[in-house]
C-alpha cells in the first residue's frame, strides 16, 4: 500500500560536483498525495540548517512526483556546502537528508577534474 | 522480482585488469547506492565502494582509490566494477549489493562471482 | 576509518537457546541526521551475505521475529531469541555512517 505522507527523496550522503559560474538547478523531489505542500531550502552551518529566503526558487511537475528547484545562476564559489530541502504537511516538518555541493573554481575546461579526481582531491574545495 | 546477477569473474593473470558487470532488475537502479564488495577465500567482507546511478558519484575505500572504478548504466540497470593493476591478493569473490538511497527500505545482494588473480 | 569488532568470534549455541554477539564501533555511528546506521548481515554457509538488520534495530522483510538488533552510539547488540538450525552461519556488522564503510571480523555460529 503506498503511503500518503509527503517523501522527500533525496539520497542519504549524496553529492555534486559542480564548476563556478556555471548554471546548477539543485532538485528536492517530492512525492504527495493530495495538496502540494510548502517546500523551502536550508544550507547547513555547523548543526543548523540556515533558511534560504532570497534565492530563486521553482517547481517542475511531473506525472508521479514534483521537484521543488533550488537556483544557482550562476554557481558562486561559496556555494559550497550541504543542502537540505524541507516539507510542512499538516503541521509536520518533513526533512530530507542533506546533499553537499562540491564547488571548484576551474580557469578551463582542460583543467576540470573528473568527479572521481574531485572527490579525491580536498585541496580544490572551497 | 529482484535479481543482482554478477559476472564477469574468473582467471586473469597478475598485473591484468578485469571489468565486472553487475546486472539488475525488479528495481529503479537509480533510486539506489551500487556497492562493490568483496571477500577473499575464507576472510570477512570488504567494502570497494559504491556508486550513484542518478549521478555518477563515487567513493572508493582508500587502498582501491586509483585502481578500481565503480561505474554504472542507469538506462541499462547495470552497474561496473573495473580493477586494474590485478595481484594474487585480489582473489576473491566479488558481490554487487544495491541499497535504497532516501529511506534504507531494503539492501540486495548478488550472488557474487569468483576473480582468482594467478600466473 | 572506524574500527568495527565483533565478539566471540565464535559461537557455539544449542538448538532453541538464545544467542547474542556484540559489535562496538571505535567511534560513534550516530549520523548528524540522528540515525545510527549500523547494519547486521547474515552469511549462510556457500550463500552470499543478506541483510538481516538496518538502522540499528529495523528487521529486514521476510527476517523472522526471533532476531533482534539493539545498541546506540558505539555499541550494538545482536541477539537470537531461539536459534533453529537455519541460523548456522556467519553473521557480520557493517557501518555506513562514515566512509569507508567498515565490516566487523564476523561471527561464526554453529550449532553445538
Known amino acids: 500500500k503506498e503511503s500518503c505522507d509527503v517523501q522527500l527523496y533525496i539520497k542519504r550522503q549524496s553529492e555534486h560536483s559542480i564548476l563556478a559560474g556555471d548554471p546548477f538547478e539543485l532538485e528536492c523531489p517530492v512525492k504527495y498525495c493530495a495538496n502540494r505542500p510548502h517546500v523551502t531550502w536550508c544550507k547547513l552551518n555547523g548543526t543548523t540548517c540556515v533558511k534560504l529566503e532570497d534565492r530563486q526558487t521553482s517547481w517542475k511537475e511531473e506525472k508521479n512526483i514534483s521537484f521543488f528547484i533550488l537556483h544557482f545562476e550562476p554557481v558562486l564559489p561559496n556555494d559550497n556546502g550541504s543542502y537540505r530541502c524541507s516539507a510542512n504537511f499538516q503541521s509536520n516538518l518533513i526533512e530530507s537528508h542533506s546533499t553537499t555541493l562540491y564547488v571548484t573554481d576551474v580557469k578551463s575546461a582542460s583543467e576540470r577534474p573528473s568527479k572521481d579526481e574531485m572527490a579525491s582531491r580536498p585541496w580544490l574545495l572551497y | 522480482e529482484v535479481q543482482l546477477v554478477e559476472s564477469g569473474g574468473g582467471l586473469v593473470q597478475p598485473g591484468r585488469s578485469l571489468r565486472l558487470s553487475c546486472t539488475t532488475s525488479g528495481f529503479n537502479i537509480k533510486d539506489t547506492y551500487i556497492h562493490w564488495f568483496r571477500q577473499a577465500p575464507g576472510k570477512g567482507l570488504e567494502w570497494v565502494g559504491r556508486?550513484?546511478?542518478?549521478?555518477?558519484?563515487?567513493k572508493y575505500t582508500a587502498s582501491f582509490k586509483g585502481r578500481a572504478t565503480i561505474s554504472a548504466d542507469g538506462s541499462k540497470s547495470i552497474a561496473y566494477l573495473q580493477m586494474n593493476s590485478l595481484k594474487t591478493e585480489d582473489t576473491a569473490v566479488y558481490y554487487c549489493a544495491s541499497y535504497e538511497g532516501y529511506y534504507e527500505r531494503f539492501g540486495y545482494w548478488g550472488q557474487g562471482t569468483l576473480v582468482t588473480v594467478s600466473s | 576509518d572506524v574500527v568495527m569488532t565483533q565478539s566471540p568470534l565464535s559461537l557455539p549455541v544449542t538448538l532453541g537457546q538464545p544467542a547474542s554477539i556484540s559489535c562496538r564501533s571505535s567511534q560513534s555511528l550516530l549520523d548528524r541526521d540522528g540515525k545510527t546506521y549500523l547494519n547486521w548481515l547474515q552469511q549462510r554457509p556457500g550463500q552470499s551475505p543478506r541483510r538481516l538488520i538496518y538502522?540499528?534495530?529495523k528487521r529486514d522483510s521476510g527476517v523472522p521475529d526471533r532476531f533482534s538488533g539493539s545498541g546506540s552510539g558505539t555499541d550494538f547488540t545482536l541477539k537470537i531469541s531461539r536459534v533453529e538450525a537455519e541460523d548456522v552461519g556467519v553473521y557480520y556488522c557493517?557501518?555506513?555512517?562514515?566512509?569507508?564503510?567498515?565490516f566487523g571480523q564476523g561471527t561464526k555460529l554453529e550449532i553445538k
Open positions: 557493517w557501518q555506513d555512517t562514515h566512509f569507508p564503510y567498515t
Open positions: 556508486n550513484d546511478p542518478a549521478n555518477g558519484n563515487t
Open positions: 538502522l540499528v534495530s
